[in-house]
Interface confidence: low
């Protein structure tokens, strides 16, 4: 029989390399079976977590797990750093694994096209 | 050539809405993130926010949470930024701006439209 | 919120005088993996929309002058005119693009004696 506790996917040790300035959705898997657990994200600032209160958060529902998206619109350098997300669950607090985001500025600035060619080649864009 | 026209100078009752435009044109429209900018008379500049035309996604500076709504119309490459609740304090100058299209200089804003006046005053 | 501090908030110069000017901000825009500053600098002429001059604390903006200059690191940066014209008297602001919100730093204008 299938256990009905609360369940959060996140993998050991996850990682995600990501562009500061791009949009990016950490997905928290969460498996529950009637009522939707409350899910929060925090990030973690040494041996405390630090609850992101006033960021976007969303839920996408499939048809055998949800996910719990915490948005980044955009990535900015202090992105950078380990996350956790936890659900209430009849008073129980379940916590996953971290996942860590390494946010990168891939491109150099001597590769930073000028404002004539931005507007003048835009094929740039699609780089 | 890159280009942001605002629409024109507003005049508003406090307590009541207005709502900006900014048409964008020269570029596509859809990969740059589209920043709006308050400047009160005489004084420095505060970032209210920005949307991304591509998907909808936005962000907030806290302090214009509430006060400030941030639309796009892909179809005619035009940003609108809604104010509501109006007081005197709101009374400035309004830009749109925007930035490059990758890394975090989507977050400097090499292009600006020439701003728009809004006065409230009953 | 990081917080941009401006100094001076006004300077008078002569034409072809050297003037700097400083910025500082409450915490690092020093990203160590890769080694950038996340400032920049914008001119902004009386009655006119601001003008990116430099990006990464010291990268020029294409079709900016070679005689402005930026520098400094972490928390201090420093925005230099060589040889000021008179068509450089405006009000110059820096931005920290580090984190949200982004913030500007109150403006140095910058004036004929």
């Known amino acids: 029989k299938e256990s009905c506790d609360v369940q959060l996917y996140i993998k050991r040790q996850s990682e995600h390399s990501i562009l500061a300035g791009d949009p990016f959705e950490l997905e928290c898997p969460v498996k529950y079976c009637a009522n939707r657990p409350h899910v929060t994200w925090c990030k973690l600032n040494g041996t405390t977590c630090v609850k992101l209160e006033d960021r976007q958060t969303s839920w996408k529902e499939e048809k055998n797990i949800s996910f719990f998206i915490l948005h980044f619109e955009p990535v900015l350098p202090n992105d950078n750093g380990s996350y956790r997300c936890s659900a209430n669950f009849q008073s129980n607090l379940i916590e996953s694994h971290s996942t860590t985001l390494y946010v990168t500025d891939v491109k150099s600035a001597s590769e930073r096209p000028s404002k004539d060619e931005m507007a003048s080649r835009p094929w740039l864009l699609y780089r | 050539e890159v280009q942001l026209q605002q629409s024109g100078p507003e005049l508003v009752k406090p307590g009541a809405s207005v709502k900006m435009s900014c048409k964008a044109s020269?570029?596509?429209?859809?990969?740059?993130?589209m920043h709006w900018v308050k400047q009160s008379h005489g004084k420095s500049l505060e970032w209210i926010g920005y949307?991304?035309?591509?998907?909808?996604?936005?962000g907030y500076n806290q302090k214009f949470k509430g006060k400030a709504t941030l639309t796009v119309d892909k179809s005619s490459s035009t940003a609108y930024m809604e104010l509501r609740s109006l007081t005197s304090e709101d009374s400035a100058v309004y830009y749109c701006?925007?930035?490059?299209?990758?890394?975090?200089?989507?977050?400097?804003?090499?292009?600006w439209g020439q701003g728009t006046l809004v006065t409230v005053s009953a | 919120d990081i917080v941009m501090s401006q100094s001076p908030s006004s300077l008078a110069v002569s034409v072809g005088e050297k003037v700097t000017m400083s910025c500082k901000s409450s915490?690092?825009?020093?990203?160590?993996?890769?080694?950038?500053?996340?400032l920049a600098w914008y001119q902004q002429k009386p009655g006119q929309s601001p003008k990116l001059l430099i990006y990464?604390?010291?990268t020029r903006e294409s079709g900016v002058p070679d005689r402005f200059t930026g520098s400094g690191s972490g928390t201090d940066f420093t925005l230099t005119i060589s040889s000021v014209k008179a068509e450089d008297l405006a009000v110059y602001y820096c931005?920290?693009?580090?984190?949200?919100?982004?913030?500007f730093g109150a403006g140095t204008k910058l004036e004929l004696k």
């Open positions: 931005q920290q693009y580090y984190s949200y919100p982004l913030t």
């Open positions: 990464w604390a010291s």
């Open positions: 949307i991304y035309p591509n998907n909808g996604g936005n």
């Open positions: 915490q690092s825009l020093l990203y160590s993996s890769n080694q950038k500053n996340y």
């Open positions: 020269g570029y596509t429209f859809t990969d740059y993130y």
């Open positions: 701006a925007i930035g490059d299209y990758y890394g975090s200089l989507r977050l400097t804003f090499a292009y």
